[in-house]
Every structure is written in structure tokens, then in C-alpha cells.
């Protein structure tokens, strides 16, 4: 069976074939080539010399136990290697040679049981190193690690390794890798020689599931003192086993290290008192908290020295009380527990994002719903009711608003967002508003996006309401029940590139309300239910227009509409997907593909 | 299309068949099996992805006695720090996992279940397999 | 299962009117588009009307401008047709259609009514 052209010339899909050695029916430019799922079984020198362009190998679960010296010899250009799952037994020292420009090895689950005997020292341009899941059972990284000096990825996570001792790092002191990110999660760690990690820098630490009790954890993260650490996560997976206790004196430790972002990633337990638990957290940058419980939410409102807080995936028993001067970023999504929204006090409050959690808000918005006059970046998607009972007073900084899919009210009954005058982005899609207001978008003067898919219009028809969104590049009007649209709607969008139009129940195409769109560049009417033209005549749509969208409309293809046809015919280098332009009538030419018509007035008669 | 045995609890009998063409081997373990009334225990997999499950995703599409509920989705894997281990698994990485399940209270009435899980992962989104469940409920009391 | 009966057919002298009638059961489709599309004998079934939701939209097939009119009931659930000056072409079986609620057109269809126009 052959393998599968996704890219002529450049990638090929040969996964599963039941190859027993490499395919020599490839062309020589090939840069992409996966191989895996199949028994290669063993990589002799210049396996791959007929790919010289090669700049990604994947031999993923190949069988592979021996790989010679050379076996890549001829692939300077490869930067991704992947050996995922292959139980190699005999790997020769000259296995990786020749990869002069590889960035990223992939060796999970290879049965790799020292990084000592690894033979990748010579990998200069080396940046990211997986090892995971395989039988490392000590972290030395031996001396070879001095010349990876562009490495910024490290995965030893799900192998053997107990302890960390000072000299294990050692390398680390000769050459600061300054950007290494380093993953030991599924260690089952149970001890760290204290000055192991002092003075030594990493971007990022992960240690999730490494403690298999409260006092190991404890004694570990004392034995991290003196790390400097960009960002640190901690934590527990679901699906592993968990810690029986957890309280403060866990994290004390902490306070011995630098930590500009900290993160806590799961946790089997109930957090009860937070200022206790993050005493030494309080002055990083940005503090992160993923899936977990959180019993009194009155905490937050401590005086603690976050710029960014991140509540993510957490059960709380109420919406928290929120007080932090010096926050500006606040990211709080698809949590449960509190539906209500309550105000917060965040004076310096510049991002909001309260996405995907069930919220309902009495009122909204003003200033003194977040208590900050800096918010630029407010999020409402996914969530409950949201009664607009007020037009955004104080937040007049907004340049980036989305409600979508939540369940939006009074929309319609006064310019709501009349004081936004910086807004460059709106997205009311899925609200259940219903426009039957035309000042609905007054004040929106630099408005370029906006998105409002799947609402509805009173009776159906588009009136003049975009008339001040004169920097309109993006509009979506698309799954709006649209039938009508007054010719004017568009006469002030002389900036507008993209207009979706699908979806709705449009009878017939008509270029005329198209004609001041001098910027238009993608037309979309896809989804529509176009029959015919609205006059017997067709304008041509403006010179800008490079792709016109009619698939999947009920095109009438009798003798007619044979000038509608034949105009169609004469836009054909405009349109898109042209095979999914298909007569709906009469039942005889149903399906048929309209360009492929011979429009003579034989058709019918 | 061959049935695939899970076990038989004291009011329910759980199978599957696979509902696509590729039909990579995929072991399910249920342990105790699943009592529909009340439940507790431990769901055990042993699985080889053909691709990797970072952002792992389900449709599920639930029938009961023929009438379709509507499709649900459930975010497995969110793509970093997820809740669970397995999300970190790369393509032709051996997974070996145990997950702990727990429910109570649900009401059922006597009947044959059907769900389709679709299991989507990856960048670009592809289908990583597709499982038909059937769930044949006697309950002992109703 | 959405069901559509057609009733108002019958045998006309040219220059007459019929007035077509369509009830859907079954589901209501206040929200879809629906139609009338007709068979003349030994040609191919072609739409005739079709009304959109709210009644904003129409179409007809160029035969019959001006002399039918399609309108809807949506309390009722119901389509009309109603058809003047008719003419022996326009003589055929008269079929009311449906959109489905999820957009699909034309997806459900009434057996059709007879209509017969004789000079």
C-alpha cells in the first residue's frame, strides 16, 4: 500500500503499511515523513540517505531495538526527531551523527535507563529533549549537557528517579542554561540534598505526582532553596495517586526560592485557608491555580501582591471576593460553584476574562462592577444571563469586549455601548438578541471586528445599524435569519474586508448593497437559500472582491434564469468550492453542478 | 461487527463495538462493573494512541430506547497542566491508566443505552477512535 | 414525522382561480420556508412559489408572476396558493414543500393535488 501525499513532494503519510524498511519510492524533496507504526525493526548507517531534505522523522512505535552509527547520516537539515515507544537495546555512539541542525529528540518510552550513556552530546543545536517514561533513575546530567547550550526543554517526567544530590546539577553551575525548562513529574521522588538547586536558574520547574506523602513533599521543596525559578507548577495529577494530606506547612519551603509565576495544578483536597497556604507566594508576579477546591473564598481579598491571578477549572461555594491593588490581569474560567457574579475591587485591573462559567450578572457593565476605570480586555463568553442595564460607564478604555453564547438582555432598548468609543472588538454571537433598536451600535467609532452570528433581526430584516462603524474590517452576520437587508446597510463600510452572510434565508443574490464596499474582499453567502437574482440585471460586486462564497444554495436552473446562470459563470474566478454549487430545481438538473450547465434556452422548453 | 465484553454488574451488562473503520486496540477494564442505580470504582484503560492526546476531547452521543439525547462534549484534556497524566501522551506512547468514577442517585429506567464516544485529540483536530457502548439496564427495582 | 396535506385542487375553465391549501402536522415550521412546486404532464417537477418565515421573502417562477400569490398562516401552520387567470399550462399535480427547521431545503413533501385547467 502506498504511502499518502498530503503535501506533494514534501509530506508523506506512511503510517501502519507494515513497511519492513524505509520506502525508496519518495521523492528526494520530501521534508515531512512519518513512518510510525511500522516494524523498521533495525536502523543500519544511511537509512535515510535518500532524504536529504528531511526536517521531520517520525518512527513512533517502528519496532526499532538497534540503531547503527550513521543511521541519519545524511539528514542535516532534520530538526524534529521522534522515537516515541521503539524499545531500543542496542544504540551505537555514533546513532545520532550527522544531525547538525536537530532541535527536537524524542525518545519516550525507549527504555532509556541513563541519560550517561545517551549519545546526543555532540547535538549543539539541540532545544528540546524528551525522555519521558523511560528507567532514569538518577538526575545527573552529565557533562555533555555543557555543550546543549540552546537547550530550553527538559522532560524526565514518569521515570525512576528518587533522589536529586548537589553534584547532579553541576553542569548547570558551569553554564547557566538560562531558559531550561525542566518537567520531573512521576518521579517518585523522596528526597532533594539541600543546595542542590542554590543559585541555579530555570524558566520553568514542573513537580506534579512526585510525593507520595506530606512530610516527603515538604522535605523536598525545603531541598529546592535557593532556585531561581521563572515559573514553578505544582501539584497532582487526577489519575495518579494523591496525597492523603495537604495543609500550609507544605509549601513553607517556598519561601527559600525566587518565583516570579507560580502555578498549583490539581489537588485532591479541600485549600481552606489560603493566605496560610501561600504565605511565601505573596509577592510573585503571577499566581495560577487549576482544579481545585476552594472552601473560603473571602481570602482573596488579602493583601496580596499578584499582577496576574488565574482561576481555572476550581469549585468554589460562592463567587470569591475579589480585593487586590496591584492586580491587572484576572483570568477566571469554566469554574463551578457561585453562578451569581459579584462586584470586585480591582483598581488596576486592565484584563478580564470570565469565560465559561455559568455566571449570571443583574447588571452590566460599569466601572463599579470590577472597580477599576483601566479594564481594556473584558470577557462574558459562555455564561449565563447578562442584563445590560448599563452602558459601560467608567470602562470607556475597552478595546476588546466578547459575549458570546451567553444569554444577553435589554439589548435593544438603548445604545449600550454608546461610551466605547476605543472598542476594536465585539463579539455578541449566540447572545439571543434579537435588534429591533437601529442605534444598537452607536459609539462604536473604531470598532474593526465585529461578530454577531446566530441572533436575529426584527422582522427578519437587516436595517441601517452599522452607519458609525466606519473602521469595519470583519463582520459576521452569519445563522441570523436574515430574508431582507435594506440597500443601505452597508453604505458606511467603505473599510470592511470580510463579510459573512451564511446561513441565512436569502431568496435571491443582489450586488447593489455591496456597492460602496470598496475594501471588500471575501463574500460569503454560503448557506442561503439563492434561487435567482433579485433584478434581472447583476452589478458587478466591487473590484476588491477575491473570493465569493455561494456553495450550498437552491440554484434554479431553468431557461429562466439564464442570465443569472450565465453571470455566475462569469464570476467563476472568483468563487470558491465552485463543485458545491449545485441546481436545486427542476428535478431533473438537482445536483448537477451549476458551471458545468450548458445555459442554452433548450433547457426547458 | 464484533462485540467487545466489558462486564455485568447486577443490573446492567456493558459492551462495545467499534464505530470506526480503523479499529485500533483499545482495552477496557471496569472495576466492580458499574451498578446503574449507584456506582463506585474504578475504570482501568490500556491504550496505544496513533496520535497524540494533548486537547483530548469526547462527543458523546447518547440513546435512550432510540430516542437521541443531544450530543455532549466533554474536555478531557485542556492542553496544558491538565488534569490528568495521560494528556501528556505522544503518539505510540504506551497508556496504562486507572481512573476513579463515582455516582449516585441517578434513577434509570429498564431499557438499552447506547453511546457513541468519539474521541478527537490533537492539532489539527482528528478522531483518535470511536466506541459504540451498549448498556442493557434490568433494573432490580424501579 | 412532519406531515403535509394539500387540499383546493379541482377541475378549472381557463381564466378561473383556485386557492391551494397546505397543512403541515406533525411539527410547527413557523420558522422554515416553505412552497409550492407542480408536475405538468411529461415534464419535470419545478418550483413554482416559495414564502419565506415571515412572509419578507418571496419568490415566483417567471410563468406565474402576477397572476399567483403565495402567502402563509403560521398560527395555522398552513401555506396558500392562491392562483388566477389560469391557464391550460398550468395544469399539473401541485406539490407543497418544506424546508427542514435545521435548513435543509425541500426536505419534506405533501402527496400533491391535482389541478386541471381545460380551455
Known amino acids: 500500500e502506498p504511502c499518502v501525499e498530503v503535501v506533494p513532494n514534501i509530506t508523506y503519510q506512511c503510517m501502519e503499511l507494515n513497511f519492513y524498511k524505509i520506502p525508496d519510492n519518495l521523492p528526494f524533496s520530501t521534508k515531512n515523513l512519518d513512518l510510525s507504526f511500522n516494524p523498521l525493526r533495525h536502523l543500519g548507517s544511511y537509512s535515510f540517505f535518500s532524504f536529504p531534505e528531511l526536517q521531520v522523522l517520525d518512527l513512533s512505535r517502528c519496532e526499532i531495538q538497534t540503531i547503527e552509527d550513521g543511521a541519519y547520516q545524511s539528514l542535516s537539515h532534520l530538526s524534529t526527531l521522534i522515537l516515541t515507544g521503539n524499545p531500543i537495546q542496542s544504540l551505537a555512539l555514533g546513532a545520532f551523527s550527522g544531525l547538525s541542525s536537530l532541535q527536537k529528540l524524542v525518545a519516550v518510552e525507549t527504555n532509556l535507563a541513563s541519560l550517561e550513556n545517551f549519545p546526543i552530546g555532540h547535538l549543539k543545536t539541540l532545544k528540546e529533549l524528551n525522555v519521558a517514561h523511560n528507567l532514569i533513575q538518577s538526575f545527573k546530567l552529565p557533562e555533555y549537557f555543557s555543550n546543549l547550550t540552546n537547550l530550553e526543554h527538559l522532560d524526565l517526567s514518569s521515570n525512576k528517579i528518587q533522589s536529586i544530590y548537589c553534584t547532579d546539577l553541576r553542569v548547570l553551575h558551569q553554564m547557566p542554561l538560562l531558559n531550561l525548562s525542566l518537567d520531573l513529574s512521576l518521579n517518585p521522588m523522596n528526597f532533594i540534598q539541600p543546595g542542590a538547586f542554590k543559585e541555579i536558574r530555570l524558566h520553568k520547574l514542573t513537580l506534579r505526582n512526585n510525593f507520595d506523602s506530606l512530610n516527603v513533599m515538604k522535605t523536598c521543596i525545603q531541598g529546592l532553596a535557593g532556585l531561581e525559578v521563572h515559573r514553578l507548577v505544582l501539584g497532582e495529577f487526577r489519575n495518579e495517586g494523591n496525597l492523603e494530606k495537604f495543609d500550609k506547612s507544605a509549601l513553607e519551603g517556598l519561601c527559600n526560592l525566587t518565583i516570579e509565576e507560580f502555578r498549583l495544578a490539581y489537588l485532591d483536597y479541600y485549600l481552606d485557608d489560603i493566605i496560610d497556604l501561600f504565605n511565601c507566594l505573596t509577592n510573585v508576579s503571577s499566581f495560577s491555580l487549576v482544579s481545585v477546591t476552594i472552601e473560603r473564598v473571602k481570602d482573596f481579598s488579602y493583601n496580596f501582591g499578584w499582577q496576574h491571578l488565574e482561576l481555572v477549572n476550581c469549585k468554589f461555594g460562592q463567587f470569591p471576593t475579589l480585593k487586590l491593588k496591584s492586580l491587572k490581569r484576572l483570568t477566571f474560567t469554566s469554574n463551578k460553584g457561585g453562578n451569581a457574579f459579584s462586584e470586585v475591587d480591582l483598581p488596576s485591573l486592565e484584563f478580564l476574562d470570565l469565560s465559561r462559567n455559568g455566571l449570571s450578572f443583574k447588571g452590566c457593565c460599569s466601572q463599579s462592577d470590577f472597580g477599576t476605570t483601566s479594564l481594556k480586555y473584558l470577557d462574558l463568553s459562555f455564561n449565563g444571563v447578562i442584563t445590560m442595564s448599563s452602558n459601560f460607564l467608567g470602562l470607556e478604555q475597552l478595546e476588546h469586549l466578547d459575549f458570546q453564547h451567553s444569554n444577553l438582555k435589554q439589548m435593544s432598548e438603548f445604545s449600550v455601548f454608546l461610551s466605547l468609543r476605543n472598542l476594536i472588538y465585539l463579539d455578541i454571537s449566540h447572545t439571543h438578541t434579537r435588534v429591533a433598536f437601529n442605534g444598537i451600535f452607536n459609539g462604536l467609532s473604531s470598532l474593526e471586528v465585529l461578530k454577531m452570528a446566530g441572533n436575529s433581526f426584527q422582522e427578519n430584516f437587516l436595517p441601517d445599524i452599522f452607519t458609525e462603524l466606519r473602521n469595519l474590517t470583519f463582520l459576521d452576520l452569519s445563522q441570523c435569519q436574515l430574508e431582507q437587508l435594506s440597500p443601505t446597510a452597508f453604505n458606511s463600510l467603505s473599510s470592511l474586508q470580510v463579510l459573512n452572510m451564511s446561513h441565512n434565508n436569502f431568496f435571491s443574490l443582489d450586488t447593489f448593497p455591496y456597492k460602496c464596499l470598496n475594501s471588500l474582499q471575501v463574500l460569503d453567502y454560503s448557506l442561503n437559500h439563492i434561487m435567482t437574482s433579485k433584478k434581472q440585471e447583476l452589478q458587478h460586486f466591487p473590484s476588491s472582491l477575491a473570493f465569493l462564497n455561494l456553495t450550498q444554495n437552491d440554484f434554479a436552473c431553468t431557461c429562466e434564469h439564464q442570465s443569472f446562470l450565465q453571470w455566475i459563470k462569469d464570476q467563476r474566478q472568483l468563487l470558491v468550492e465552485v463543485e458545491r454549487m449545485e441546481c436545486a430545481t427542476p428535478s431533473d438538473k438537482q445536483g448537477m453542478p451549476v458551471l458545468s450547465l450548458n445555459i442554452t434556452c433548450q433547457m426547458n422548453k | 461487527q464484533k462485540q467487545y465484553w466489558v462486564c455485568n454488574s447486577s443490573d446492567a451488562s456493558i459492551s462495545y463495538t467499534y464505530c470506526d473503520k480503523m479499529q485500533y486496540p483499545i482495552s477496557i477494564n471496569v472495576n466492580p462493573c458499574i451498578e446503574l442505580k449507584r456506582s463506585k470504582g474504578l475504570l482501568h484503560i490500556f491504550y496505544i494512541p496513533r496520535r497524540d492526546l494533548k486537547q483530548l476531547y469526547f462527543n458523546l452521543y447518547i440513546t435512550v430506547n432510540t430516542m437521541n439525547l443531544p450530543k455532549r462534549k466533554e474536555v478531557i484534556c485542556r492542553g496544558s497542566d491538565d488534569d490528568y497524566s495521560f494528556c501528556r501522551a505522544l503518539k505510540g506512547e504506551t497508556v496504562n491508566t486507572t481512573i476513579s468514577f463515582s455516582f449516585k442517585g441517578i434513577k434509570f429506567s429498564k431499557g438499552k443505552y447506547k453511546c457513541v464516544v468519539e474521541a478527537i485529540s490533537g492539532s489539527p483536530e482528528e478522531m483518535l477512535f470511536c466506541l459504540e457502548f451498549v448498556i442493557l439496564h434490568q433494573p432490580n427495582s424501579n | 414525522e412532519v406531515q403535509l396535506v394539500e387540499s383546493g385542487g379541482g377541475l378549472v375553465q381557463a381564466g378561473g382561480s383556485l386557492r391551494l391549501s397546505c397543512v403541515a402536522s406533525g411539527r410547527t415550521l413557523s420558522s422554515v420556508n416553505m412552497g409550492w412546486f407542480r408536475q405538468a404532464p411529461g415534464k419535470e417537477r419545478d418550483i413554482v412559489a416559495r414564502?419565506?418565515?415571515?412572509?419578507?421573502?418571496?419568490y415566483y417562477a417567471e410563468s406565474v408572476k402576477g397572476r399567483f400569490t403565495i402567502s402563509r398562516d403560521n398560527a395555522k401552520n398552513t401555506v396558500y396558493l392562491q392562483m388566477n387567470s389560469l391557464r391550460p399550462e398550468d395544469t399539473g399535480v401541485y406539490y407543497c414543500v418544506a424546508d427542514s427547521p435545521g435548513g435543509r431545503s425541500y426536505e419534506y413533501w405533501g402527496q400533491g393535488t391535482q389541478v386541471t385547467v381545460s380551455s
Open positions: 414564502i419565506s418565515p415571515s412572509s419578507v421573502s418571496t
